[in-house]
């Protein structure tokens, strides 16, 4: 005997109390697949969460974090406090990056500046709490007699006067 519930589409549930009639999901609930015997309660975006997408009868709500927080985990299951650039979040709150480290985002941890010398390069721009160092040419490239960092201007062809 065919299970009549299999005919119930997404957005409905198979109501055994009413001879397996497909009843619409009640407000604040959904069923994303057919043949369901119950509808799932919609996620509520409350507190530090705000609604990005409301629940429909066939899909759950989706949440974002309110201003000053960012999402963590699958489907934004948690909200974590933002810090400023140049800081990282610790158990005691937002703390400035230690010397030699930086964070260019509002989330995540402070990371060490790039060690230019490991690549045989020199520091072109010093690092800050918010920005990594910028590595430039190696010291040898900048020594007297070495070729310039910028290519020479091309020589004019004979017989052409300057513009």
């Amino acid at each position: 005997l065919q299970d009549l519930c299999s005919n119930c589409p997404a957005g409905t549930f198979c109501d055994n109390n009413r001879s397996q009639i497909c009843s619409p999901c009640p407000p604040n609930s959904f069923s994303s697949a057919g043949g369901q015997r119950t509808c799932d309660i919609c996620r509520q975006c409350k507190g530090v969460f705000k609604t990005r997408k409301e629940c429909s009868s066939t899909s759950n709500a989706e949440c974002d974090c309110i201003s000053g927080y960012h999402c963590l985990g699958a489907e934004c299951s948690m909200c974590e406090q933002d810090c400023k650039q140049g800081q990282e979040l610790t158990k005691k709150g937002c703390k400035d990056c230690c010397f030699g480290t930086f964070n260019d985002q509002k989330r995540g941890i402070c990371r060490p500046w790039t060690n230019c010398s490991l690549d045989g390069k020199s520091v072109l721009v010093n690092g800050t709490k918010e920005r990594d160092v910028v590595c430039g040419p190696s010291p040898a490239d900048l020594s007297p007699g070495a070729s310039s960092a910028t290519p020479p201007a091309p020589a004019r062809e004979p017989g052409h006067s300057p513009q």
């Epitope: 957005g11 407000p27 604040n28 990005r52 066939t58």
Partner: antibody, heavy 116, light 107 residues
Framework: QVQLQQPGAELVKPGASVKLSCKAS????????INWVKQRPGQALEWIGN????????NYNGNFKSKATLTVDRSSSTAYMHLSSLTSKDSAVYYC?????????WGQGTTLTVSS | DILLTQSPAILSVSPGERVSFSCRAS??????IHWYHQRTNGSPRLLIK???ESISGIPSRFSGSGSGTDFTLSINSVESEDFADYYC?????????FGSGTKLEIK
């Protein structure tokens, strides 16, 4: 900021039909329900139904099932309510309002007058 | 359909007074009640959601309480801009329904 724009007024003859519009802006149209609410002069609010623009899910108040049809145009972020076989009892202010459960943003309302 | 009964139909108070509005549901609706006010010739505005949750941008003098069948909206010190019609709405089951409203007028 979130806005729901509705025409101020519509005048139609008895027996005719009308299509009321509600243009949404300031948010992702397909992510939030649009509800329609009727208010006759000096009377309480009456929920007509709602539509989810993301997938065209609809729910209707049984009193309006043969009167109102809800649709959306996703390309213009506009919700519509088609009212048929109009009589003087359909003369009212019709509001569109955003929200799945509590209605957090409302249009200014369209005053529908049914008169010959 | 769930019937929402609001009482009284009219409340007369002076500015600065505390006022409470009542909304009674015909069956248990948990906390699926929302409160609105509507000034003359204006659109309704959401004041409280889910019986007691505050709404961003709504003054803190508005508060809500209750669950099951009996709900209350309170204004702890009425201001001149609060004189309006007040409606409750349930979202526990289809169709959504509104109460008949309470008019808050100046005494």
């Amino acid at each position: 900021q979130v806005q729901l724009q509705q025409p101020g007024a519509e005048l139609v003859k008895p027996g005719a039909s009308v299509k009321l519009s509600c243009k949404a802006s300031g948010y992702t149209f397909t992510n939030f329900w649009i509800n329609w609410v009727k208010q006759r002069p000096g009377q309480a609010l009456e929920w007509i139904g709602n539509i989810y623009p993301g997938n065209d899910n609809t729910n209707y108040n049984g009193n309006f099932k043969s009167k109102a049809t809800l649709t959306v145009d996703r390309s213009s972020s506009t919700a519509y309510m088609h009212l048929s076989s109009l009589t003087s009892k359909d003369s009212a202010v019709y509001y569109c309002a955003r929200g799945q459960l509590g209605l957090d943003y409302w249009g200014q309302g369209t005053t529908l007058t049914v008169s010959s | 359909d769930i019937l929402l009964t609001q009482s009284p139909a009219i409340l007369s108070v002076s500015p600065g007074e505390r006022v409470s509005f009542s909304c009674r549901a015909s069956q248990n609706i948990g906390t699926a009640i929302h409160w609105y006010h509507q000034r003359t010739n204006g659109s309704p505005r959401l004041l409280i959601k889910f019986a007691s949750e505050s709404i961003s941008g709504i003054p803190s003098r508005f508060s809500g309480s209750g669950s099951g069948t009996d709900f209350t909206l309170s204004i702890n010190s009425v201001e001149s801009e609060d004189f309006a019609d007040y409606y409750c709405q349930q979202s526990n089951s289809w169709p959504f329904t509104f109460g008949s409203g309470t008019k808050l007028e100046i005494k």
